[in-house]
Interface confidence: low
C-alpha cells in the first residue's frame, strides 16, 4: 500500500508519457490521476516502467475500478497484465479476440501462467464455445492448449474449429481427449479425398475405433510407426495381420523394433504365430499353431 502524499508543485501529470519513468513511487501515486491513466493505457506499454512503478499504476486502476476493469483498459494493459492476479481477472468481461491476443502477446514465449489460464477460461466461457478464430489464436500462442482441456471442455469445440488444429497441438493429448476430438475431426474432414483425408485425420487417430482403422487399411495410406504407436490398444487388437500390413504398408518392418511396446506387444499376443510369420519380421509371442482362438469380443457379448 502506497502512502497518500501531496503531489509536489509542478509535478502533476497532465499526460502519461516517458517522463513518468523518472517519478518515484510515491510521486506516481500522488501525481498521476487514475482516470487519465485509464484513458491513456495504450502509452503505458511503450514506457519502460519498473516493476515497482507498475505496482503503483495497478493500484491506481484497482481503486478506480474495484468491480473490474473495462475492456477498453484491459486491451491496453500490456506489461501491466503480468501484475494481475487470477482474482483480478475473474472480475473482467473480455469479449474481443483482439483483447485476448494483446494480452497473450505479453506472455508470449512463457509457460501458460495461472493468469493466462484464467483469462482464457473467462473468454471461452463468455463466448460459449471454442470457435475457430479463438482456437486459432490460442493454439498459435500455446500449442499444447487443446490438450490442457478436459474431455468435457473439448466437447464444446465445434467441428469447424478442427481445421485450426495442427499436429503439434495434439502432441500431449491423452486417449480420453482424442476420443472426443476424433469424431469431430472425422466430421470436419469428411468431404476430402482419401490421401488428403488421411493427412488431416492422422493426428487424431489416437481416438479412432477399430472399424475406422479397418477402413483405412483398405486405402493404401502407409501409416507411419509413430502414428500406429499412438493408436488405442483396444482398437488395434482386433486388426488382423493382413490389415496391419496394409495399414502400415512399407512401414510394417518397424513392428520388429516395437514388439515389446504397446500396442504392438498386446496385438502380437492376439495373433496366430503362423500369421505373424507371413510378415517375415521374426515377430514372436503369437498364439501357437493349432491353438483355439476365442473371439474375445464375441465372448463378452455372450456373457
Amino acid at each position: 500500500e502506497v502512502e497518500k502524499t501531496a503531489c509536489p508543485s509542478g509535478k502533476k501529470a497532465r499526460e502519461i508519457d516517458e517522463s513518468l519513468i523518472f517519478y518515484k513511487k510515491w510521486e506516481l501515486e500522488a501525481c498521476v490521476d487514475a482516470a487519465l491513466l485509464a484513458t491513456q493505457m495504450d502509452r503505458v506499454n511503450a514506457i519502460p516502467f519498473t516493476y515497482e512503478q507498475l505496482d503503483v499504476l495497478k493500484h491506481k486502476l484497482d481503486e478506480l475500478y474495484p468491480q473490474g476493469y473495462p475492456e477498453s483498459v484491459i486491451q491496453h494493459l500490456g506489461y501491466l497484465f503480468l501484475k494481475m492476479s487470477p482474482e483480478d481477472i475473474r472480475k473482467w468481461n473480455v469479449t474481443s479476440l483482439e483483447t485476448l491476443k494483446a494480452l497473450l502477446e505479453v506472455n508470449k514465449g512463457h509457460e501458460m501462467s495461472p493468469q493466462v489460464a484464467t483469462l482464457i477460461d473467462r473468454f471461452v466461457k463468455g463466448r460459449g464455445q471454442l470457435d475457430k478464430d479463438t482456437l486459432d489464436t490460442l493454439t498459435a500462442f500455446y500449442p499444447g492448449y487443446l490438450c490442457s482441456l478436459s474431455p468435457e471442455e473439448l466437447s464444446s469445440v465445434p467441428p469447424s474449429s478442427i481445421w485450426a488444429v495442427r499436429p503439434q497441438d495434439l502432441d500431449t493429448c491423452d486417449p480420453r481427449q482424442l476420443d472426443v476430438l476424433y469424431p469431430k475431426a472425422r466430421l470436419a474432414f469428411q468431404n476430402m479425398n482419401g490421401s488428403e483425408y488421411f493427412v488431416k485425420i492422422q493426428s487424431f487417430l489416437g481416438g479412432a475405433p477399430t472399424e475406422d482403422l479397418k477402413a483405412l487399411s483398405q486405402q493404401n495410406v502407409s501409416m507411419d510407426l509413430a502414428t500406429f504407436m499412438k493408436l488405442r490398444t483396444d482398437a488395434v487388437l482386433p486388426l488382423t495381420v493382413a490389415e496391419v500390413q496394409k495399414l502400415l504398408g512399407p512401414h510394417v518392418e518397424g513392428l520388429k523394433a516395437e514388439e515389446r511396446h504397446r500396442p504392438v506387444r498386446d496385438w502380437i499376443l492376439r495373433q496366430r504365430q503362423d500369421d505373424l510369420d507371413t510378415l517375415g519380421l521374426g515377430l514372436q509371442g503369437g498364439i501357437p499353431n493349432g491353438y483355439l482362438v476365442l473371439d474375445l469380443s464375441m465372448q463378452e457379448a455372450l456373457s
Epitope: 499526460e15 519513468i21 523518472f22 506499454n45 511503450a46 514506457i47 519502460p48 519498473t50 516493476y51 500490456g78
Partner: antibody, heavy 121, light 108 residues
C-alpha cells in the same frame, strides 16, 4: 525491416524556417515513442525531446523547450522536427530514433540516418 | 540533470586487445537504466547495450556491459577492425535523459 528514413540535408540562412522529417516503416509507428537527438560538429549526442505519434503528445528537454517543435502525422508514419527561425548555432546533424518497447525500453533501439542542417549567411 | 563522464576520452589499442570503457554518473542511475551506443564516422549511432548489461539484437558476444549505481563499464573482449569507433553511454533514469561525451577507440 524496421527502419527510420530521414529527409535530406538542408542549407539555410539565419532567420529562415525549416521542417525535417523522419518516416518509420516495418513496425507499428503509433505504438512507439520517437525521440530527436542533436549532434553538433565534432561533438557528442544531446537528447532534444520525444513524441507519441498516436496522438502527438510531446515532451522536450529543458534545453530545447521553445527552440524547436516536434510533431507527427500518424497517417503517413512520419515525425517532424521544425524551427521557426534558425540560428547559426543550430548547425548540426539531427537524428530521429525509436524508443525500445516496454520494460526493456527507454534506450533508442532504431536510428534514422541523420539529417545535416547547415545554417550560414 | 545527471552528468555522465566517460573515460578515457581516447583509447588507443590494437586489434585483438581488450577494451574497457568507463561511464561514471554524477548521481545514482537506478534500475540499470543505462545504454551504450557505437558511432562510426558519418554514421548514425547504434544501440549495443541496454539495461546496463543486456545486448541488443545482433550485437556480437564480444561486447558486454556491467555496473550499477554510478559506475558502468563497456568491455570489448577482443577488438575487431570494425570496432574502432566512438562509444557513448546514456542514462534514461532521470529526466531529461543524458549522454556521456563519448570515448573514441582508435587503432594504435
Amino acid at each position: 525491416q524496421v527502419q527510420l528514413v530521414q529527409s535530406g540535408a538542408e542549407v539555410k540562412k539565419p532567420g529562415e524556417s525549416l521542417k525535417i522529417s523522419c518516416k518509420g516503416s516495418g513496425y507499428s509507428f503509433t505504438n512507439y515513442w520517437i525521440g530527436w537527438v542533436r549532434q553538433m560538429p565534432g561533438k557528442g549526442l544531446e537528447w532534444m525531446g520525444f513524441i507519441w505519434p498516436s496522438d502527438s503528445w510531446t515532451s522536450y528537454s529543458p534545453s530545447f523547450q521553445g527552440q524547436v517543435t516536434i510533431s507527427a502525422d500518424k497517417s503517413i508514419s512520419t515525425a517532424y522536427l521544425q524551427w521557426s527561425s534558425l540560428k547559426a548555432s543550430d548547425t548540426a546533424m539531427y537524428y530521429c530514433a525509436r524508443y525500445g518497447h516496454g520494460m526493456y525500453g527507454g534506450a533508442l533501439d532504431v536510428w534514422g540516418q541523420g539529417t545535416l542542417v547547415t545554417v550560414s549567411s | 540533470d545527471i552528468v555522465l563522464t566517460q573515460s578515457p576520452a581516447t583509447l588507443s589499442l590494437s586489434p585483438g586487445e581488450r577494451a574497457t570503457l568507463s561511464c561514471r554518473a554524477s548521481q545514482s542511475v537506478r534500475s540499470s537504466r543505462l545504454a551504450w551506443y557505437q558511432q562510426k564516422p558519418g554514421q548514425a549511432p547504434r544501440l549495443l547495450i541496454y539495461g546496463a548489461s543486456k545486448r541488443a539484437t545482433g550485437v556480437p558476444a564480444r561486447f558486454s556491459g556491467s555496473g550499477s549505481g554510478t559506475d558502468f563499464t563497456l568491455t570489448i573482449s577482443s577488438l575487431e577492425p570494425e570496432d574502432f569507433a566512438t562509444y557513448y553511454c546514456q542514462q534514461y533514469y532521470d529526466f531529461p535523459p543524458t549522454f556521456g561525451q563519448g570515448t573514441k577507440v582508435e587503432i594504435k
